[in-house]
């Protein structure tokens, strides 16, 4: 039997400089594409190898992106969120929420779709 799973939630401001191939990550979520039950937020689903985000090292798969250059990502359609990133300019400031899984007791299994990545 698995122990109780808790999450340690932290927020961080990450400043990325757009590279030759862009910011270097994929997202899921939005009001029309809920990735996490009852949450229309925007989550990082992939960090591209050698991309700007990967080289910076702080953004992680499973992170929730709260804002881009100060603009809140709440209640956005998925494509509107994509477009916001694409039009964010050369220097991009991301407010992100990291959700670290803390296991109490025997180690559990995190399934696909869990926002912790």
């Amino acid at each position: 039997m698995n122990g109780r799973v808790d999450y340690l939630v932290t927020e961080e401001e990450i400043n990325l400089t757009r590279g030759p191939s862009g910011l270097g990550f994929n997202i899921v979520g939005g009001t029309d594409q809920q990735y996490v039950s009852n949450d229309s937020g925007i989550y990082v689903s992939r960090i591209k190898e050698n991309g700007a985000a990967a080289l910076d090292g702080r953004l992680q798969e499973g992170d929730k992106i709260l804002s881009v250059n100060g603009q809140d990502l709440k209640n956005l359609l998925h494509q509107d969120a994509v477009d916001l990133f694409r039009n964010a300019g050369y220097a991009v400031s991301l407010r992100v929420q990291h959700r670290l899984q803390v296991q109490n007791g025997p180690i559990g299994h995190r399934g696909e779709g869990d926002p912790s990545g």
Epitope: L23, N26, Q33, G113
Partner: nanobody, 127 residues
Framework: EVQLVESGGGLVQAGGSLRLSCAAS????????LGWFRQAPGKEREFVAA????????YYADSVKGRFTISRNNAKNTVYLQMNSLKPEDTAVYYC?????????????????????WGQGTQVTVS
């Protein structure tokens, strides 16, 4: 881990039709960006078609435009490639590819590096 399984390949005469299917694992299928590629003997892997998470946006190689149609059924975790007016030069192993989510950068559907997961392929032979 996402797993992709293609089916529907076979031998068909020129001018005929085939419908390929690619069944995917994972409860977040509706977020996947999906593509079809093909590889003929002695040639490089070639982009065929791609579709976004909702099915609202599709992309095609010039060589198949007007003959092939990509579609998806998110309820069935499956992406399809309807191939009509087949030509001998369409003979190849056809591969399904997937990535979770949408890139925030400019999207090149024909770049294999855009995809993280690949099926084993299904053989299509047009005589």
């Amino acid at each position: 881990e996402v797993q992709l399984v293609e089916s529907g390949g076979g031998l068909v005469q020129a001018g005929g039709s085939l419908r390929l299917s690619c069944a995917a694992s994972g409860r977040t299928f509706s977020t996947y960006t999906l593509g079809w590629f093909r590889q003929a003997p002695g040639k490089e892997r070639e982009f065929v078609a791609a579709i976004n998470w909702s099915g609202g946006t599709t992309y095609y190689a010039d060589s198949v435009k007007g003959r092939f149609t990509i579609s998806r059924n998110n309820a069935k975790n499956t992406v399809y490639l309807q191939m009509n007016s087949l030509k001998p030069e369409d003979t190849a192993v056809y591969y399904c590819a997937a990535v979770i989510g949408s890139t925030v950068d400019s999207y090149d559907p024909g770049d294999p590096l855009e995809y993280d997961y690949w099926g084993q392929g299904t053989q299509v032979t047009v005589s």
